[in-house]
Interface confidence: low
């Protein structure tokens, strides 16, 4: 439905508060280095302009597209070339090329200082002094560090952030009330950002068809009582929402997401019995709740899949008439019967089925050719099952920290060219699969584990894409979205790698390690472990364990010493020498 003024349409639909918040997110995700005050100024100018268009949709420039309006505004930033270099060249382009250019310059790992949490009293004072600015600052800081964060969901996080401060700044023990809530928001936020990053990568690198296939599988698991046409409608609408958000069209995205939530709640009888509670909530909570809703119960007495997809004489006829519709039906029927499978496994099965039909429907006897297609699924199902079983056993044996270390060693040996911070970050996240998923019963382990691993490996892929250093990573990341995890799992030690030169500075530690949190101290030790493996890729588990145990003892001893700095200097030299001897460096 065409509107005379798109900016007026979105302002009216979303309301001023959400409009301003979403424009701030959009600008911060594009110009990640700009100071907060500059962004606030731009947002206020856009908002004032939008209000003139609401008053008179025929007013000058009100008929311009949002990309044109926002792009023009971003290109007024005076320091664009000094701050962003070649991104300034985007401003010489016309829409839609200009927006595409801005999108290509989004940085998944911007060079920004780590967010340091101030004292609780300082935060509460800032919150009370100027609540609006305090919350805008939150949106800005998250958006610029996570340029693909799902904008309507960030509004939900900001609402919870505000609620936490409203409640806890009045509490007797402010810190005890606030800090756990902020930790939870931080962890959930990182997870949400990573999940959305995979959706955007799926759309941008593999296309709409890949995203739609993922959505058919996931929604069919979640809504197994909904019929195929209903799932297809939801998939179409969901694809539009995510295409918009991933493309920087945040106002349209938030508006369409609200419409989708409304539709789902109005039609919950034909979608899922689990939506009732979600649909009673306010908009932001409702949308979040629907996105996280548990799988509905499977309908009783679902017939065998073989009848329609193997035994029927019409398989090739139906496939030929509408390939994607027929494959979509297959994926829907398989997924609604298998909430115990990961989405990526379901997509591998659908791909195998498609490949078989492509081959067999051209054969002399198609039915004879595809009759055993379901037998080809068995090894595909067993591979992730076995992998998860082995890794959960290892996790239960080692605990999270040591399990992460095992993965650090494993992945550093596979792809030693990758930067140490990236290997540490990715392996730590891979290791979290244990505490996240191994506690689940068998029926929930695979969807939890393998779909989580897809999200984490995508982090590796997007970080590596920025500065590619390993052909093996590039290959696993680009060949097939659904086979990324099996591709990385199959990598052996990189025999072509030339070990890194030994540098004693890398293994020199100071007393400041003693004041770090347990998590930060772990990261320091894990960084050293990655560096050790890069120096000695053929080191055995036993050798590495001995060195890491010595290292832990060294840190503990020096942190208890009276003269910590001297201890780190003297004992550190001994540790380096002993480690070199132990590893034959």
């Amino acid at each position: 439905d065409a509107h005379k003024s798109e900016v007026a349409h979105r302002f009216k639909d979303l309301g001023e508060e959400n409009f301003k918040a979403l424009v701030l997110i959009a600008f911060a995700q594009y110009l990640q280095q700009c100071p907060f005050e500059d962004h606030v100024k731009l947002v206020n100018e856009v908002t004032e302009f939008a209000k003139t268009c609401v008053a008179d949709e025929s007013a000058e420039n009100c008929d311009k597209s949002l990309h044109t309006l926002f792009g023009d505004k971003l290109c007024t930033v005076a320091t664009l070339r000094e701050t962003y270099g070649e991104m300034a060249d985007c401003c010489a382009k016309q829409e839609p090329e200009r927006n595409e250019c801005f999108l290509q310059h989004k940085d998944d790992n911007p060079n920004l200082p780590r967010l340091v949490r101030p004292e609780v009293d300082v935060m509460c004072t800032a919150f009370h002094d100027n609540e609006e600015t305090f919350l805008k600052k939150y949106l800005y800081e998250i958006a610029r560090r996570h340029p693909y964060f799902y904008a309507p969901e960030l509004l939900f996080f900001a609402k919870r952030y505000k609620a936490a401060f409203t409640e806890c700044c009045q509490a007797a023990d402010k810190a005890a009330c606030l800090l756990p809530k902020l930790d939870e928001l931080r962890d959930e936020g990182k997870a949400s950002s990573a999940k959305q990053r995979l959706k955007c990568a799926s759309l941008q690198k593999f296309g709409e068809r890949a995203f739609k296939a993922w959505a058919v599988a996931r929604l069919s698991q979640r809504f197994p009582k909904a019929e195929f046409a209903e799932v297809s409608k939801l998939v179409t609408d969901l694809t539009k929402v995510h295409t918009e958000c991933c493309h920087g069209d945040l106002l349209e995205c938030a508006d369409d997401r609200a419409d989708l939530a409304k539709y789902i709640c109005e039609n919950q009888d034909s979608i899922s019995s689990k939506l009732k509670e979600c649909c009673e909530k306010p908009l932001l909570e409702k949308s979040h709740c629907i996105a996280e809703v548990e799988n509905d119960e499977m309908p009783a007495d679902l017939p065998s899949l073989a009848a329609d997809f193997v035994e029927s004489k019409d398989v090739c006829k139906n496939y030929a008439e509408a390939k994607d519709v027929f494959l979509g039906m297959f994926l829907y029927e398989y997924a609604r019967r298998h909430p115990d499978y990961s989405v990526v496994l379901l997509l591998r099965l659908a791909k195998t089925y498609e490949t078989t039909l492509e081959k067999c429907c051209a054969a002399a006897d198609p039915h004879e050719c595809y009759a055993k297609v379901f037998d080809e699924f068995k090894p595909l199902v067993e591979e992730p099952q076995n992998l998860i079983k082995q890794n959960c056993e290892l996790f239960e044996q080692l605990g999270e920290y040591k399990f992460q270390n095992a993965l650090l060693v494993r992945y550093t040996k596979k792809v030693p060219q990758v930067s140490t911070p990236t290997l540490v970050e990715v392996s730590r996240n891979l290791g979290k699969v244990g505490s996240k998923c191994c506690k689940h019963p068998e029926a929930k382990r695979m969807p939890c584990a393998e779909d989580y691993l897809s999200v984490v490996l995508n982090q590796l892929c997007v970080l590596h894409e920025k500065t590619p250093v390993s052909d093996r990573v590039t290959k696993c990341c680009t060949e097939s979205l659904v086979n990324r995890r099996p591709c990385f799992s199959a990598l052996e030690v990189d025999e072509t790698y030339v070990p890194k030169e030994f540098n004693a500075e890398t293994f020199t530690f100071h007393a400041d390690i003693c004041t770090l949190s347990e998590k930060e101290r772990q990261i320091k030790k894990q960084t050293a472990l990655v560096e050790l493996v890069k120096h000695k890729p053929k080191a055995t588990k036993e050798q590495l364990k001995a060195v890491m145990d010595d290292f832990a003892a060294f840190v503990e001893k020096c942190c208890k010493a009276d003269d910590k700095e001297t201890c780190f200097a003297e004992e550190g030299k001994k540790l380096v020498a002993a480690s070199q001897a132990a590893l034959g460096l």
Epitope: E227, N267, V325
Partner: nanobody
Framework: EVQLLESGGGLVQPGGSLRLSCAAS????????VAWFRQAPGKGREFVAG????????YYADSVKGRFTISRDNSKNTLYLQMNSLRPEDTAVYYC???????????????????WGQGTLVTVSS
């Protein structure tokens, strides 16, 4: 916009046959998921049969399977419902419904169809 106009209803004896037609204008019928629904006196709308847009994958309600056949003639931009072995419980107003655009499949959910004809009455009685 899609306009739909049903015809072919009437009075028929049990065991008899009727063929309903639905002429579409404003959009090609082969680009549209189309279906027949019916509404018996005092009851809600019930899905009868459907056919996907661009694909001849057909769907039937269990109560009509083997007796009714849905088809379309793209050159005439018309949808048909061939009804054989009619029973008194088939008495209802029959509606043709269209759902343009992707996904190009039919649905049993009446609310998903934005375009409807005005209906044609089928009475099965001796």
């Amino acid at each position: 916009e899609v306009q739909l106009l049903e015809s072919g209803g009437g009075l028929v004896q049990p065991g008899g046959s009727l063929r309903l037609s639905c002429a579409a204008s404003g959009r090609y019928i082969d680009e549209t998921a189309v279906a027949w629904f019916r509404q018996a006196p005092g009851k809600g709308r019930e899905f009868v049969a459907g056919i996907g847009g661009g694909v001849d994958i057909t769907y039937y309600a269990d109560s009509v399977k083997g007796r009714f056949t849905i088809s379309r003639d793209n050159s005439k931009n018309t949808l048909y419902l061939q009804m054989n072995s009619l029973r008194p419980e088939d008495t209802a107003v029959y509606y043709c419904a269209a759902r343009p655009g992707r996904p190009l499949i039919t649905s049993k959910v009446a609310e998903l169809y934005p375009y409807w004809g005005q209906g044609t009455l089928v009475t099965v009685s001796s």
